[in-house]
Amino acid sequence: FKVATLYSLYVCPEGQNVTLTCRFFGPVDKGHDVTFYKTWYRSSRGEVQTCSERRPIRNLTFQDLHLHHGGHQAANTSHDLAQRHGLESASDHHGNFSITMRNLTLLDSGLYCCLVVEIRHHHSEHRVHGAMELQVQTGKDAPSSCVAYPSSSQESENITAA
């Protein structure tokens, strides 16, 4: 299976909410013994490999933000911990996997990584990740709402705030 990032860059004004999204697709083993562990973390653009470094998102680690469920089951974090930090990760039936960040501040700017790990009998088999950048802007140059720039082309799309 693979992970695709719908947008490689999100530019948002301070105070706005944003939903960063990844989609995982390809041959998914729907056997009872296979589940998927999905999570988010911050990183930096490493010289060797993007997403190799793991940093927390608003003090929450990738363990705090994880979802662990069957192939295309819907799920979301019910952790009070995440919601207290203005975060929620979610996954739908179509392979979309997202994290919503509320009330953005300049400190939220940076590189974000989504990670999907295929688990069989509680042990990892394959892992893939996707990366995207979030720029939070303030002042007169800031957009009025979040703008997302697609990964595959230079066109931009306005996206509705979560």
């Epitope: 589940t35 562990y37 994880h66 662990h68 688990i119 042990h123 088999e125």
Partner: antibody, heavy 122, light 112 residues
């Protein structure tokens, strides 16, 4: 401090049913996979069931498959083991245990409860 | 099922001595992802089991460095470099590389 406290153990007749509970505290219960392990009177340990953090995936050995059901209530920080069609060979001390994992890859049971005794006898 | 065989069944030692416990699996427990999921647990009298070693050789936090694990494939060893009174109890190896997960029969460490 991580604490796991089992309850519900009892003396039951063969063919009967019993539900064990394991109350968890001192950690974010919904972030961890959990298992039940039993210890027979001859002190042998046997893995009984495992459930992932969200409760969507369970696994059992053939010896209990179809008779035992592991479940969890993350809102109540509680793990359960529903046992039915009990046999004399199910007589054991039942422990709940928390898994340590990295990215969903379970690699150890690092915390165990004190156990709950189940006796199956006519 | 993977059969885990421990030896000896009973190991009498003097305090301060080195102790060595063997665990053999009926087939290789090297997982397809490259990890070997072999753990060691100690159960002291009247207590529940406690984790000592995971993935063959990694000590769990708080476990003294006199405990060490080694091995690969089908042969594994737990060594205690200088046995202390608090080390007495039954030691179990446990594999989760293949389902069903299986324990060894246990080795009782006792004072000579």
């Amino acid at each position: 401090e991580v604490q796991l406290v089992e309850s519900g153990g009892d003396l039951v007749k063969p063919g009967g049913s019993l539900k064990l509970s394991c109350a968890a505290s001192g950690f974010t219960f919904s972030s961890y996979g959990m298992s039940w392990v039993r210890q027979t009177p001859d002190k042998r340990l046997e893995w009984v069931a495992t459930i992932n953090s969200g409760g969507s995936y369970t696994y059992y050995p053939d010896s209990v498959k179809g008779r035992f059901t592991i479940s969890r209530d993350n809102a109540k920080n509680t793990l359960y083991l529903q046992m039915s069609s009990l046999k004399s060979e199910d007589t054991a001390m039942y422990y709940c245990a928390r898994h340590e994992d990295y990215e969903g890859d379970y690699y150890a049971m690092n915390y165990w409860g004190q156990g709950s005794s189940v006796t199956v006898s006519p | 099922d993977v059969l885990m065989t421990q030896s000896p069944l009973s190991l009498p030692v003097s305090l301060g001595d080195q102790a060595s416990i063997s665990c053999r699996s009926s087939q290789s427990i090297l997982h397809s992802n490259g990890n070997t999921y072999l753990e060691w647990y100690l159960q002291k009298p009247g207590q529940s089991p406690k984790l000592l070693i995971y993935k063959v050789s990694n000590r769990f936090s708080g476990v003294p460095d006199r405990f060490s694990g080694s091995g690969s494939g089908t042969d594994f060893t737990l060594k205690i470099s200088r046995v202390e009174a608090e080390d007495l109890g039954v030691y179990y190896c446990f594999q989760t590389s293949h389902v069903p997960w299986t324990f060894g029969g246990g080795t009782k460490l006792e004072i000579k």
